[in-house]
């Protein structure tokens, strides 16, 4: 039987257009679903806000690549957080919908902070 | 619903080249990397390369280049992977693939080439 | 480039056994390694990234483990749909590459 997550499905619409300082950043999400129009990165800072950038870019394959590398440095408690733990505040250009989604997004986060403009999330049942 | 459509099956001669297909729907191509990937008869799986189809950037695993040349058109929102010079050696079932981060979440149902001599 | 091997390229397995598969990488992968299911005729399936993230559909039988170079995909009661040959990918660096493969047998 399949495993599934009833938590709300996490989409980017736009990416910023913005280099948010690496300082800033704790962590960040792949997101992959098929139900979201485009893949993307959503990275978290260090204030909890939630930021999508488009995965093309160079810069934001370079902070991935950084975050993943500094995670192997942080305490194992802190390599994965739930996806319920970083919707604390909206994402920039995210609409949060309601659907069962296993893996929606992954999560990956270090201990390497924030201003970023938060977007009204949508939960739809 | 993301589909990969691969034409099943090419028979193409020693020395000939070929240009194998891969339509996409349920996405729009130019949001993500098309790769492809090699199957040889009864053996692993080798990245051949991927393509940006925004821009027309592409990628190589060295040990094909030469050897392949991957383009896209994103008016019919299409990936291509031509292969050139063909002996038994690229007899393989060729897989497309789409995935922004290197690793593949949908796959074609593959093309399986034919070399002979 | 990245070399990655499964030690195993088969293994026989009862129905309901607990199965590990092995995977290790010639350097630190930091995490970004995949699972793939192949049935004979059929493309690969993605099951896990990042090394332990469930893909949407799989079951949860399935597990992803490791870190640094060594990484392991576990099925704690094997199921029938199960046999298949499985290979992981790392995704740290182009050219990526894969595990030669374990393909599971029904003893």
């Known amino acids: 039987q399949p495993d599934a997550v009833n938590a709300p499905l996490t989409c980017c619409y736009s990416f910023t257009s913005k280099m948010i300082p690496m300082s800033r950043l704790e962590s960040y999400k792949r997101i992959t679903s098929s139900r979201c129009p485009k893949e993307a990165v959503v990275f978290v800072t260090k204030l909890k806000r939630e930021v999508c950038a488009d995965p093309k870019k160079e810069w934001v394959q370079t902070y991935i690549k950084n975050l993943d590398r500094n995670q192997m440095r942080s305490e194992p408690t802190t390599l994965f957080k739930t996806a319920s733990a970083l919707r604390s505040s909206a994402p920039l250009n995210v609409k949060l919908t309601r659907k069962s989604e296993a893996n929606a997004s992954t999560t990956f986060s270090t201990t390497t902070s924030s201003t970023s403009v938060g977007v009204t999330s949508v939960t739809v049942n | 619903e993301v589909q990969l459509q691969q034409s099943g099956a090419e028979l193409v001669k020693a020395g000939a080249s070929v240009k194998l297909s891969c339509p996409a729907s349920?996405?729009?191509?130019?949001?993500?990397?098309m790769h492809w990937v090699k199957q040889r008869p009864e053996q692993g799986l080798e990245w051949i390369g991927r393509i940006d189809p925004a821009n027309g950037n592409t990628k190589f695993d060295p040990k094909f280049q030469g050897k392949a040349t991957i383009t896209a058109d994103t008016s019919s929102n299409t990936a291509y992977l031509q292969l050139s010079s063909l002996t038994s050696e690229d007899t393989a079932v060729y897989y497309c693939a789409r995935g922004v981060f290197g690793f593949f979440d949908y796959w074609g149902q593959g093309t399986t080439l034919t070399v002979s001599s | 480039d990245i070399q990655m091997t499964q030690s195993s390229s088969s293994f026989s397995v009862s129905l309901g056994d607990r199965v590990t598969i092995t995977c290790k990488a010639t350097?630190?992968?930091?995490?970004?390694l995949a699972w793939y299911q192949q049935k004979p005729g059929s493309a690969p399936r993605l099951l896990i990234s990042g090394a332990t993230s469930l893909e949407t559909g799989v079951p949860s039988r399935f597990s992803g483990s490791g870190s640094g170079k060594d990484y392991t995909l576990s099925i704690t009661s094997l199921q029938t749909e199960d046999v298949a040959t499985y290979y992981c990918q790392q995704f740290w660096s182009a050219p990526y590459t894969f595990g030669g493969g374990t393909k599971l047998e029904i003893k």
């Open positions: 350097e630190d992968i930091y995490n970004r």
């Open positions: 349920g996405l729009n191509i130019k949001d993500t990397y």
